[in-house]
């Protein structure tokens, strides 16, 4: 599941990792665009082993994965994969 949330909270991520996470280990991805109290874009990944990590948005592997997911969501899904929550 790929999600984009707009919230009024401060930054969630206190540290970020660039370490590659294989797709098969990922359960959910959340994208928090910059603004609304946080000056940077944040990407949160929930892994299937019940752990959670903030991923550096500049990491090449996450950028490639996001692009694949975007293409897949626009071409194969009847409803958008992006969920927008606007307070």
């Amino acid at each position: 599941v790929l999600e984009v949330y707009y919230t009024s909270l401060r930054c969630r991520c206190v540290q970020e990792s660039s370490v590659f996470i294989p797709r098969r280990f990922i359960d959910r991805i959340q994208i928090l665009p910059r603004g609304n109290g946080c000056p940077r874009k944040e990407i949160i990944v929930w892994k299937k082993n019940k752990s959670i990590v903030c991923v550096d948005p500049q990491a090449e592997w996450i950028q490639r994965m996001m692009e694949v997911l975007r293409k897949r969501s626009s071409s194969t899904l009847p409803v958008p994969v992006f969920k927008r929550k606007i307070p």
């Epitope: 969630r12 206190v14 540290q15 949160i44 929930w46 082993n49 019940k50 752990s51 959670i52 903030c54």
Partner: antibody
């Protein structure tokens, strides 16, 4: 307001089975990311993580005790349970029920119960 | 399993002292460490998360730092309410493991 409360026998004999109940309020175990676990502390000693159960019924156990532990939940009644079989005196401890929520920043065991003291004695 | 070696196991200090407690991880835990404070007869509560970040309501005299595999909790100026047990926890991987704990007493 998040609260957790442990209940179970105060005393039991070696080789018996210990069953602990955690009754919680202020949160539910049904939303994505929510978990409840058990941690114990022998008197005057350190903490030992025992087990976690998650919203999707995924379970994690301490490998050193995995053959004796069973964690379960009753989501509709806001309860979690821990069963320890074949107890001996080294299982005497205060047992804590703890909450974990997979949100950022992730702080496992952010809320604790008051603990229940269990003594194994013949 | 990841071993957390905590030291000292107990220590005495005077009010106003600077106090440091350390935990060494047996492998890289990448800051996935929490410090808990446990006052006598009470349950533990989170003090510092991700090695260096103060939990809500924790006084600024507490701080955490990391040097390679060594993690430290420092109280800059000890107050009487700080007399407690302190525990480190690694949550990098299961099984989550605690240090053995440090009992902090008044000299």
């Amino acid at each position: 307001q998040v609260t957790l409360k442990e209940s179970g026998p105060e005393i039991l004999q070696p080789s018996q089975t210990l069953t602990l109940t955690c009754t919680f309020s202020g949160f539910s175990l049904s939303p994505y990311g929510m978990g409840v676990g058990w941690i114990r502390q022998p008197s005057g000693k350190g903490l030992e993580w025992l087990a976690n159960i998650w919203w999707d019924d995924d379970k994690y156990y301490n490998p050193s005790l995995i053959n004796r532990l069973t964690i379960s939940k009753d989501t509709s009644n806001n309860q979690a349970f821990l069963k320890i079989t074949n107890v001996d005196t080294t299982d005497s401890a205060t047992y804590y029920c703890v909450r974990s929520e997979l949100v950022m920043p992730y702080v496992p065991f952010d809320y604790w119960g008051q603990g229940v003291m269990v003594t194994v004695s013949s | 399993d990841i071993q957390m070696t905590q030291s000292p196991s107990s220590m005495s200090a005077s009010l106003g002292d600077r106090v440091t407690i350390t935990c060494q991880a047996s492998q890289d835990i990448e800051n996935d460490l929490i410090w808990f404070q446990q006052k006598p007869g009470k349950s533990p509560r989170p003090l510092i998360y991700y090695a260096t970040n103060l939990a809500n309501g924790v006084p600024s005299r507490f701080s955490g730092r990391r040097s390679e595999s060594n993690y430290a909790l420092t109280i800059s100026s000890l107050e009487s309410e700080d007399m407690a047990d302190y525990h480190c926890l690694q949550f990098k991987q299961y099984p989550y493991t605690f240090g053995a704990g440090t009992k902090l007493e008044l000299k």
